[in-house]
Interface confidence: low
């Protein structure tokens, strides 16, 4: 999906009002310096691409993020503020239902959500122009 035409300010508002707090709740009890940020993004569409990938694509050691509160709110925000996003997700959601596993908060999931926090921070902070 090409995130270029999303309403970034509305997504930012959704993040600041709710998604950020859900991410913090998920990470509660974890030190902010425990994980190094290894994933980054260069502009808002790129950030959303990375955020979608980390939030909804199961990875080795962490298959359970898609049903977390922050993930559902992320999905809702993208569906509302990114034209055509919902349609592209129908097939992906069908496939995910078939392989959903028991919800377990692993250290790998915590690391992945820490990366997500970093990506959201970058999304919310358009880079200053280089002078």
């Amino acid at each position: 999906y090409d995130f270029t035409n999303c309403d970034f300010e509305k997504i930012k508002a959704a993040y600041l009002s709710t998604i950020s707090k859900d991410l913090i709740t998920y990470m509660s009890g974890t030190k902010s310096t425990e994980f190094n940020n290894t994933v980054s993004c260069s502009n808002r569409p790129h950030c959303l691409t990375e955020i979608q990938s980390l939030t909804f694509n199961p990875t080795a050691g962490c298959a359970s993020l898609a049903k977390e509160m922050f993930a559902m709110k992320t999905k809702a925000a993208l569906a509302i503020w990114c034209p055509g996003y919902s349609e592209t997700q129908i097939n992906a959601t069908q496939a995910m239902k078939k392989r959903r596993k028991r919800k377990v908060t692993t250290n790998k999931c915590l690391e992945q959500v820490s990366q997500l926090q970093g990506l959201w921070r970058r999304f919310n902070r358009p880079l200053l122009k280089q002078q």
């Epitope: 980054s40 970093g118 970058r122 919310n124 880079l127 200053l128 280089q130 002078q131």
Partner: antibody, heavy 121, light 105 residues
Framework: EVQLVQSGAEVKKPGASVKVSCKAS????????MNWVKQAPGQRLEWIGI????????SYNQKFKGRATLTVDKSASTAYMELSSLRSEDTAVYYC??????????????WGQGTTVTVSS | EIVLTQSPATLSLSPGERATLSCRAS?????MHWYQQKPGQAPRPWIY???NLASGVPARFSGSGSGTDYTLTISRLEPEDFAVYYC????????FGGGTKVEIK
């Protein structure tokens, strides 16, 4: 624990330049902006400028544009503020201050201890 | 540039009294931050985004306001509250107010 440790006091002659450093630790240096703030003796806080360690992008207070230069060394997690063509009114304490967007606002949540720069002939 | 004007410049009060500090912006801002500074020390974040107390700040402090007018209130002054308080905005670059010194009467 987030810490910003600044370089020591400097005494400079008018017309010279000074470069103040600010070593960051306890967080991912490239995640947050770094501000520089001036405080002349008995005076208000005065914003100099801001830099994004992620890409080196900067924004300056018009008053300091052309004389202040903000840079970073990502590998050393260190921010720098260089002030050129010094004059007596540049005598002040200079602070670096990390800026984060906690509480839905971009606030300066951690400050260095300050570097005193004295300009005197 | 948005200019922030703090009043009064100096507030002379006794411990136990109520303190009201004002910060007025030359044009509307989204919200205001407040910092406390004591002699020889760096400023410390005190109130974030108009009304959120920074970590460790006592509940006797509160912040309010919108648009161009913002207020920091101390319900009952304690000896450790005597300091200079600065407001700061970032809606248009970053600017600080001139500060209000809260001193013991």
């Amino acid at each position: 624990e987030v810490q910003l440790v600044q370089s020591g006091a400097e005494v400079k002659k008018p017309g010279a330049s000074v470069k103040v450093s600010c070593k960051a630790s306890g967080y991912t240096f490239t995640d947050d902006y770094m501000n520089w703030v001036k405080q002349a003796p008995g005076q208000r806080l005065e914003w100099i400028g801001i830099i994004s360690p992620y890409n080196g992008g900067t924004s300056y207070n018009q008053k300091f544009k052309g004389r202040a230069t903000l840079t970073v060394d990502k590998s050393a997690s260190t921010a720098y503020m260089e002030l050129s063509s010094l004059r007596s009114e540049d005598t002040a304490v200079y602070y670096c201050a990390r800026e984060d967007y906690d509480y839905d606002g971009y606030a300066m949540d951690h400050w260095g201890q300050g570097t005193t720069v004295t300009v005197s002939s | 540039e948005i200019v922030l004007t703090q009043s009064p410049a100096t507030l002379s009060l006794s411990p136990g009294e109520r303190a009201t500090l004002s910060c007025r912006a030359s044009s509307s801002v989204s919200y205001m931050h407040w910092y406390q500074q004591k002699p020889g020390q760096a400023p410390r974040p005190w109130i974030y985004a108009t009304s959120n107390l920074a970590s460790g700040v006592p509940a006797r402090f509160s912040g309010s306001g919108s648009g161009t007018d913002y207020t920091l209130t101390i319900s009952r002054l304690e000896p450790e509250d005597f300091a200079v308080y600065y407001c700061q905005q970032w809606s248009s670059n970053r600017t600080f107010g001139g500060g209000t010194k809260v001193e013991i009467k």
